[in-house]
């Protein structure tokens, strides 16, 4: 376990071999989750890229947060996708949080502390527990089958995950840098493996 506070993973160039694999102590399927993270890239007006890829053997797109060029954020649960459009692209560090719950299917998507309109996805579904969680690449199969054209070039950090839906107040607290206790992925006690050309550097966001 490593305390990654104030640090970020840096992916300096396009590749299909560089990634970070995150280890999560999940023992049972997820009926809800929240993922929050920071990232910083110049790619958004150039091409799509993977932000967070959670694959199981049953479904390579179990959870996927992806930037789709000319559209915005693509969010997939269990292979089914919804979009959160972004009309104008700026180059700046971004903080996102997204949550989903099986009981209602409701998805929340927050960008820099601001919520997008709630949407619905995969009501009644459960997310598999035996997962390969990858930063920097999009998994087309469990733990692999990467394409350079979908890789992240830039920085990613503060990746935290919970097995429940955070309240708006809790998400606001996280965005403002307040205290929180993630129970699936914890950036302050991170288990991870680096493959390829990935560097750990001080974070560039406040």
């Amino acid at each position: 376990q490593t305390d990654m506070s104030r640090k970020a993973f840096v992916f300096p160039k396009e590749s299909d071999t560089s990634y970070v694999s995150l280890k999560a102590p999940l023992t049972k399927p997820l009926k809800a989750f929240t993922v929050c993270l920071h990232f910083y890239t110049e790619l958004s007006s150039t091409r799509g890229y993977s932000i967070f890829s959670y694959a199981t053997k049953r479904q390579d797109n179990e959870i996927l947060i992806f930037w789709s060029k000319d559209i915005g954020y693509s969010f997939t649960v269990g292979g089914s996708e919804i979009l959160f459009e972004v009309p104008e692209v700026t180059v700046a560090p971004v903080h996102i949080c997204t949550s989903w719950e099986s009981a209602s299917g409701i998805v929340e998507f927050w960008v820099d502390g601001k919520p997008r309109v709630r949407k619905s996805l995969k009501k009644g579904y459960t997310v598999g527990a035996e997962a390969s969680i990858i930063l920097g690449q999009e998994q087309d199969s469990f733990g692999g089958n990467f394409e350079g054209s979908q890789s992240l070039v830039g920085d990613i950090g503060n990746v935290n995950m919970w097995d429940f839906v955070l309240s708006p107040d809790e998400i606001n607290t996280i965005y403002l840098g307040g205290p929180f206790s993630p129970n699936v992925l914890n950036w302050r006690a991170l288990k991870y493996e680096v493959q390829g050309e990935v560097f750990t550097k001080p974070q560039l966001w406040p």
Epitope: N61, G79, S80, K119, L121, K123, D140
Partner: nanobody
Framework: EVQLQQSGPELVKPGASVRMSCKAS????????IHWVKQSHGESLEWIGF????????YYYKNFKGKATLTFNRSSSTAYMDLRSLTSEDSAVYYC??????????WGQGTTLTVSS
Amino acid sequence: EVQLQQSGPELVKPGASVRMSCKASGYTFTDYNIHWVKQSHGESLEWIGFVNPDNGDTYYYKNFKGKATLTFNRSSSTAYMDLRSLTSEDSAVYYCARGTTVEKDYWGQGTTLTVSS
């Protein structure tokens, strides 16, 4: 076995409208989005849009807003695309595909549309 079966070729006059279909089988229809793609002769693929049969969401790429209308029927596991105000520029092969904006794993065989007077 997953299959996407598309309707047959269409020959229509300029200014008319057309509907083409894509019948899905071999999986739960509401589990995946259905995308529609245009391939003009000798040109690269153009993404038209997609429909999410689970929640009813539709998304249209810029060039096809107002040109295409995407619908579906859950009970028959069929997706439809209507194209309006047709011109010769709309002559192409149109494909449906299952998947996401990131990746599409199964494709229909294509429907050829010819717009000619």
